[in-house]
Interface confidence: low
């Protein structure tokens, strides 16, 4: 098992951001700040942004930094999945992707991060302060969930600012960081901050909801905020609830399973079929060493788009081939 710390990848720079202030110089401190704030904890990050071109269209991006194998990602809105939230998409590393309106496109960005684009029309369209949650099931670490939303005053095209805070539903002790790298990063961050005192930057303030970690204050649109990070532990509670979807999901989960070609008989109809989206190669994963778990190699990539699926009334858990049909 490799022991380097995985640094959250940066979002591609916005058009026209290559300004005089220096894109790279602005971004690096916030990467390091994110690392310093969240060092030593399992990291799930959520980023929500409203598209500038379609004001009611949202992009949700989520990622997981841990040492286990991701076995499932569930994206929900209106609250955590299973606690009042409604499932928007389910992504399995080998078996494919399912999504429900108003989700337009769910996909893997890397082997440990996903993105979801939501349509912005109709009764089920999200409102600006809807909470979106991402839940990662990792073997054997268990399940981790983080939630996030756009600040009410966000301008279109902007991402939610970094808002590190502990997840209420995080059920496992912290995953160990790589202290040497982080220590160097934090020292370097302080050095950078001292050099760039004259530049406006977001100020950290203690979170009112949790004394354990700081929460960043939203700031005015700037090049720094537009070059936003993937943010661990974005938990912003909102009062806005989405309209009920056309395909109802009892217990906050999806009404599973389309009628697909299968050897199994008597399967119920479901709202949609799995998308046979090719899964990106998984060779770039860098894991954090965790003394709790057995050392093991990386999961090999699933290279083909053809996914053999076996729907079952019990839902996705019952499909043949728990870790993917290889």
């Amino acid at each position: 098992m490799r022991t380097e710390a995985q640094v959250p990848a940066l979002q591609p720079p916005e058009p026209g951001l290559e300004g005089a202030m220096g894109h790279r110089t602005l971004v690096l401190p916030w990467v390091l700040l994110t690392l310093c704030v969240t060092a030593g904890t399992p990291e799930v990050w959520v980023q929500v942004r409203m598209e500038a071109t379609e004001l009611s269209s949202f992009t949700i991006r989520c990622g997981f930094l841990g040492s286990g194998s991701i076995s499932l990602v569930t994206v929900s809105w209106g609250g955590p999945n299973g606690a009042g939230g409604t499932t928007l998409a389910v992504l399995h590393p080998e078996r494919g992707i399912r999504q429900w309106a108003p989700a337009r496109q769910a996909r893997w960005e890397t082997q440990s991060s996903i993105s979801l684009i939501l349509e912005g029309s109709g009764a089920s369209s999200p409102c600006a302060n809807t909470t979106f949650c991402c839940k990662f099931a990792s073997f054997p670490e268990g399940s981790w969930e983080a939630c996030g939303s756009l600040p009410p005053s966000s301008d279109p095209g902007l991402s939610a600012p970094p808002t590190p805070a502990p997840i209420l539903r995080a059920d496992l002790a912290g995953i160990l960081g790589v202290s040497g790298v982080l220590l160097f990063g934090c020292v370097y961050l302080l050095h950078l901050l001292r050099r760039h005192k004259h530049r406006p930057a977001p100020r950290l303030q203690p979170s009112r909801t949790s004394p354990q970690a700081p929460r960043a204050r939203a700031w005015a649109p700037s090049q720094a905020s537009q070059a936003a990070l993937h943010v661990p532990y974005a938990t912003i509670n909102t009062s806005c609830r989405p309209a009920t979807l056309d395909t109802a999901h009892p217990h906050g989960g999806p009404s599973w399973w389309a009628s697909l070609p299968t050897h199994a008989a008597h399967r119920p109809q479901g709202p949609a079929a799995w998308a046979s989206t090719p899964i990106p190669a998984r060779g770039s994963f860098v894991s954090v060493e965790n003394g709790l778990y057995a050392q093991a190699g990386e999961r090999p990539p699933h290279t083909g788009p053809g996914l053999t699926l076996f729907p079952d009334p019990r839902g996705p858990r019952a499909m043949e081939g728990p870790l993917g049909v290889r």
């Epitope: 194998s69 499932l72 059920d171 217990h251 989960g253 057995a294 996705p316 858990r317 019952a318 081939g321």
Partner: antibody, heavy 120, light 106 residues
């Protein structure tokens, strides 16, 4: 029909070794994560080990780590549990379990169990 | 590790009676599983992910709960339901089971 048939149990002295086997049929064995779960004489269920499919990762609770080794032979559709340095508290009925981790980690298929008694 | 405490340890119910048993976790868990074990048999998956019925399980069984408090409800007791019921979690390493609730037919 899914079938998991355990074998290899028996009476062994403390400090001894034993190797359990589990023959699987009726499902795509190579695609399933597999576990061993034991049930003590007091009827408590205890997770013993898990092995994933494909990348063959193995996981153990601290109580057996370093003493027990789970392995699989996908060509033979067989799961194994090598037990060393056995203790009296390892006395139990050992179940071979197939579990679909697609949604999380419930255990779908259970064998009938094989009894292990550690006693001098 | 997360300790699951099931209560009551033993209970009895008459045919047609509604039965509820609980599983309390020492720390918050995301999902819970329930198994049924009849005398002389292996455990059988009953409910997965807190509230979803496994294949072939009668609809009189239902599961609910969140956080640290979960329950298994049997809407109408039948003779074949006499068994021991175990809860299990894997929200946190290691996987753990409850000690079980023995349901007897009155």
């Amino acid at each position: 029909e899914v079938q998991l048939v355990e074998s290899g149990g028996g009476l062994v002295k403390p400090g001894g070794s034993l190797k359990l086997s589990c023959a699987a049929s009726g499902f795509t064995f190579s695609s399933y994560a597999m576990s061993w779960v034991r049930q003590t004489p007091a009827k408590r269920l205890e997770w013993v080990a898990t092995i994933t499919s494909g990348d063959i990762r193995t996981y153990y609770p601290d109580t057996v780590k370093g003493r027990f080794t789970i392995s699989r032979d996908n060509a033979k559709n067989t799961l194994y549990l090598q037990m060393r340095s056995l203790r009296s508290e390892d006395t139990a009925m050992y179940y071979c379990v197939g579990h679909d981790d697609f949604h999380f980690y419930a255990m779908d298929y259970w064998g009938q169990g094989t009894s292990v008694t550690v006693s001098s | 590790q997360i300790v699951l405490t099931q209560s009551p340890a033993i209970m009895s119910a008459s045919p047609g009676e509604k039965v509820t048993m609980t599983c309390s976790a020492s720390s918050s868990v995301s999902y819970l599983y329930w198994y049924q074990q009849k005398p002389g048999s292996s455990p059988r998956l009953l409910i997965y992910d807190t509230s979803n019925l496994a294949s072939g399980v009668p609809v009189r069984f239902s599961g609910s709960g969140s956080g640290t408090s979960y329950s298994l409800t049997l809407s109408r007791m039948e003779a074949e339901d006499a068994a021991t019921y175990y809860c299990q979690q894997w929200s946190s390493y290691p996987l753990t089971f409850g000690a079980g609730t023995k349901l007897e037919l009155k």
